[in-house]
């Protein structure tokens, strides 16, 4: 018992002596955060000058405070022990570590391109004022059906697969009427209506696709992640939409 007590005391003395010799060798190690070791004044600890800070002890200089100017605004003021923190003014959002950049907001249903804010292409959406347009979820990949159609601002909502729909549940396509004798004119007119609707849809789709192809060729966009601050666009919407494939990080696309 006495032996172990002796060991503890010896260790404590050793540690205390080490700390003493270390501070004798390097008096700067005693300087706390918010101060710096002033070589010009016999290495005494001097407080950081205004607009500077030191976040750790034993520093020989204080760092200049970050200034939140222009589109940046101060989220946290600089103190003698910590740097200022910035965020972006409304209409802009932060990018990069510690909000090193501010990027212009667009509207939901748009994305920011080199030429400003562009509407999302058909089949893509952006539910935020920042970021890129992303493809609608493909419900069929999960064996589900589309419950709510997608828009430029919102993704599709997937529902149960058509097979899972219980009898009596409302279905998009009406069930085919039962074949009964003496009802052939109704059946014929029903199928005629169905075929003409399908043809109309096909015609509409082809027209739409042709116009998108033409427009896509007319305006090939180079889309990039902006390394600088964009000026605020006074007119956010231009004609045309910004098209990209999901796997593309940069560059435009032709439909």
């Amino acid at each position: 018992m006495g032996n172990s007590c002796y060991n503890i005391v010896a260790t404590l003395l050793l540690v205390l002596n080490f700390e003493r010799t270390r501070s004798l060798q390097d008096p700067c190690s005693n300087c706390p955060a918010g101060t710096f070791c002033d070589n010009n004044r016999n290495q005494i600890c001097s407080p950081c000058p205004p607009n500077s800070f030191s976040s750790a002890g034993g520093q020989r200089t204080c760092d200049i405070c970050r200034q939140c100017k222009g589109v940046f605004r101060t989220r946290k003021e600089c103190s003698s022990t910590s740097n200022a923190e910035c965020d972006c003014t409304p209409g802009f959002h932060c990018l990069g570590a510690g909000c090193s950049m501010c990027e212009q907001d667009c509207k939901q249903g748009q994305e920011l391109t080199k030429k400003g804010c562009k509407d999302c292409c058909f089949g893509t959406f952006n539910d935020q004022k920042r970021g890129i347009c992303r493809p609608w979820t493909n419900c069929s990949l999960d064996g589900k059906s589309v419950l709510v159609n997608g828009t430029k601002e919102r993704d599709v909502v997937c529902g149960p697969s058509p097979a899972d729909l219980s009898p009596g549940a409302s279905s998009v396509t009406p069930p085919a009427p039962a074949r009964e004798p003496g009802h052939s004119p109704q059946i014929i007119s029903f199928f005629l209506a169905l075929t003409s609707t399908a043809l109309l849809f096909l015609l509409f789709f082809l027209t739409l696709r042709f116009s998108v192809v033409k427009r896509g060729r007319k305006k090939l966009l180079y889309i990039f992640k902006q390394p600088f601050m964009r000026p605020v666009q006074t007119t956010q919407e231009e004609d045309g939409c910004s098209c990209r494939f999901p796997e593309e990080e940069e560059g435009g696309c032709e439909l």
Epitope: R75, D87, P90, C94, G96, A97, G98, C99, Q108, D127, Q128, K129, R130, G131, R134, D155
Partner: antibody, heavy 117, light 107 residues
Framework: EVQLVESGGGLVQPGGSLRLSCAAS????????IHWVRQAPGKGLEWVSG????????YYADSVKGRFTISRDNSKNTLYLQLNSLRAEDTAVYYC??????????WGQGTLVTVSS | DIQLTQSPSSLSASVGDRVTITCRAS??????LAWYQQKPGKAPKLLIY???NLETGVPSRFSGSGSGTDFTLTISSLQPEDFATYYC?????????FGQGTKVEIK
């Protein structure tokens, strides 16, 4: 379907630590900031912390700054909140919430953290 | 930090009533304000974003208005499922502050 599921809550002594997790599914995780919001029993909502989609910018309420650390693992679609130096006033249900344009459009069901000796 | 003050703290109303809840900010938050509904034991649900935009799937009886410092949430005709606590939240500053809440109870 967007889902957020919190876990890791429990009883802890004052001064103790805890790590909360929030597993996300049904959306592109990296495209959204995620936040922690807490609610003390019988009280209102209090924003705690937030992190950007890339994980490179973090935000904290003054009441937790220096004690709590928010992080995310985008490869696992998981958000974390490390709670250190816990106090009795940290007792609350902790919700993770997806940020869409600075508002919170989807919330988890919450996990209860009780700080008591 | 920006403070949000809701009024009233609680109110009693009947089904079919028109209900108005106000939220006042200690400084201008532009239109960066959202409204949430919370029922006991459940997570909050987003109702209104950007002060006046109705969130997808939220009934049209809910509406929001205002900008700057004064905001209003209106329920045009109160339904049984609307009895809950309502919170406003500002996102003008990155410290997303919430109002203290307004409890809507059955009269």
């Amino acid at each position: 379907e967007v889902q957020l599921v919190e876990s890791g809550g429990g009883l802890v002594q004052p001064g103790g630590s805890l790590r909360l997790s929030c597993a996300a599914s049904g959306f592109t995780f990296t495209s959204y900031g995620i936040h922690w919001v807490r609610q003390a029993p019988g009280k209102g909502l209090e924003w705690v912390s937030g992190i950007s989609g890339a994980g490179d910018t973090t935000y904290y309420a003054d009441s937790v700054k220096g004690r709590f650390t928010i992080s995310r693992d985008n490869s696992k679609n998981t958000l974390y909140l490390q709670l250190n130096s816990l106090r009795a006033e940290d007792t609350a249900v902790y919700y993770c919430a997806r940020e869409r344009d600075y508002d919170f459009d989807y919330w988890g069901q919450g996990t209860l953290v009780t700080v008591s000796s | 930090d920006i403070q949000l003050t809701q009024s009233p703290s609680s109110l009693s109303a009947s089904v079919g009533d028109r209900v108005t809840i106000t939220c006042r900010a200690s400084q201008s938050v532009s239109s960066y304000l959202a409204w949430y509904q919370q029922k006991p034991g459940k997570a909050p649900k987003l109702l209104i974003y950007d002060a006046s935009n109705l969130e997808t799937g939220v009934p049209s009886r809910f509406s929001g208005s205002g900008s700057g410092t004064d905001f209003t949430l209106t329920i045009s005709s109160l339904q049984p499922e609307d009895f809950a606590t309502y919170y406003c939240q500002q996102s003008y500053s990155t410290s997303h502050t919430f109002g203290q809440g307004t409890k809507v109870e059955i009269k």
